[in-house]
């Protein structure tokens, strides 16, 4: 009796759903009194299917209404947990362990990310020295530094501070300002770069003719 | 609010065969099982098998085994049964019947099925 | 596979009183989750069956409260405080714990 996998790593961004699976042989009919199925990260148990259902009762509460076996997958060889509403502390190394007539193991890696996609920008300006702040902030995971161009590829020096994300204690709340004397309709970018996995989310900044009071805000 | 219709009576001859349709509305066809029951007039309910519409997994009573085949259309949220090799045994009330892995909440209207010469 | 046995009629009741149905599984519906997977449905002359309770003890939505359940892992009883005339019909057990699903032969409700 072997459990096979297909993938062995799964990545997956923060928010989003993964289905990791393991296959076992089935011949015939499934028969349901007969199939142990067990999926674990680390020490928390997540799924204990046992005699044809899931016991609610020994699942960790981190994956409460979030965690299910597929059991129509089942029929089909697979032993298939879905993760739904994926959060940056589920990546870790999975465990699948299969029981029906003879027992095996596997291990599967989960990854989860998170991009620096909803960038919020705010353009303001000192009313005496006529100079513009310009403020870059979004959440993401891993750390990402940012990098200011100007219109013409010019790159500029930012100051940049990253603080623990209020929504969850993984996720990273990078903040960045550039202060430049710029003129109307000038264009600025704020470039989001994240290593691990590589990616890069920029966002526009218009200097605008005049700024109202309280100083405008958008989201990119 | 979730409808099974189910199509109208057939009467076939022996030995030939006849599909039965069931058209789910109201909820997602693909989240749901849909179950099958026969009823022979005057008697009791028998659990035919199940065909989960997302993936298409069936399972099947044994005694129904070779007899019945559970098929969908997931375009038009039908799912359908396959009945060959009819003989008067198979003369029944066929029911489809809606349910999540433990629970079985909504049937169809039934569908009268009679094989005779 | 799973037996359920019922007896196939019931003591006549009258109506405005209370009657009970019982039903045995050849093995416990007891899972070790907790939850006895135990369903009872009604066929009333000429309709669909409906389902009335699952899991041994959960009214189905719509279902009046004058339905109730109990039970052991195999020995169940659906009990109709103040019976009405709509209640008559037959009355099916099914159990969901195996597959296959199974129902039991039914019990037929009969007024006085």
């Known amino acids: 009796f072997t459990i096979t996998v297909s993938k062995d790593l799964y990545v997956v961004e923060y928010g989003g759903n993964v289905t990791m699976e393991c296959k076992f042989p089935v011949e015939k009919q499934l028969n349901l009194f007969a199939l142990i199925v067990y999926w674990e990260m680390e020490d928390k148990k997540i799924i204990q299917f046992v005699n044809g259902k899931e016991d609610l009762k020994v699942q960790h509460s981190s994956y409460s209404q979030r965690a299910q076996l597929l059991k129509d997958q089942l029929f089909l060889g697979k032993a298939a947990l879905q993760i739904t509403d994926v959060r940056l502390q589920d990546a870790g190394v999975y465990c699948c362990l299969i029981g029906y007539g003879g027992a095996d193991y596997k291990r599967i890696t989960l990854k989860v990310h998170a991009p620096y996609r909803n960038i919020s920008q705010r353009i303001s300006v000192d009313p005496v020295t006529s100079e513009h702040e310009l403020m870059c902030q979004a959440e993401g995971y891993p750390e990402a530094e940012v990098i200011w161009t100007s219109s013409d590829h010019r790159v500029l020096s930012g100051k940049t501070t990253i603080t623990n994300s209020n929504r969850e204690e993984k996720l990273f709340n990078v903040t960045s300002t550039l202060n430049i004397n710029a003129t109307a309709n000038e264009i600025f970018y704020c470039t989001f770069q994240r290593s691990g996995p590589e990616e890069n989310n920029t966002a526009e900044l218009v200097i605008p003719e005049r700024l109202p009071v309280p100083a405008s805000e958008r989201t990119h | 609010q979730v409808q099974l219709q189910q199509s109208g009576p057939e009467l076939v001859k022996p030995g030939a065969s006849v599909k039965i349709s069931c058209k789910a509305s109201?909820?997602?066809?693909?989240?749901?099982?849909m179950n099958w029951v026969k009823q022979r007039p005057g008697q009791g309910l028998e659990w035919i098998g199940w065909i989960f519409p997302g993936s298409g997994a069936t399972y099947y009573n044994e005694r129904f085994m070779g007899k019945a085949t559970l098929t969908v259309d997931k375009s038009s949220n039908t799912a359908y049964m396959l009945f060959s090799s009819l003989t008067s045994e198979d003369s029944a009330v066929y029911f489809c019947?809606?349910?999540?892995?433990?629970?079985?909440?909504?049937w169809g209207q039934g569908t009268t099925l009679t094989v005779s010469s | 596979d799973i037996v359920m046995t019922q007896a196939a009629f019931s003591n006549p009741v009258t109506l405005g009183t209370s009657a009970s149905i019982s039903c045995r599984s050849s093995r416990s519906l007891l899972h070790t989750n907790g939850i006895t997977y135990l369903s009872w449905f009604l066929q009333k002359p000429g309709q669909s069956p409906q389902l009335l309770i699952y899991q041994m003890s959960n009214l189905a939505s719509g279902v009046p409260d004058r339905f109730s359940s109990s039970g052991s892992g195999t020995d169940f009883t659906l009990r109709i405080s103040r019976v009405e005339a709509e209640d008559v019909g037959i009355y099916y057990c099914?159990?969901?714990?195996?597959?296959?699903?199974?129902f039991g032969g039914g019990t037929k409700l009969e007024i006085k």
């Open positions: 109201g909820y997602t066809f693909t989240d749901y099982y």
């Open positions: 099914a159990q969901t714990l195996g597959l296959p699903r199974t």
């Open positions: 019947l809606r349910s999540d892995w433990d629970v079985g909440d909504f």
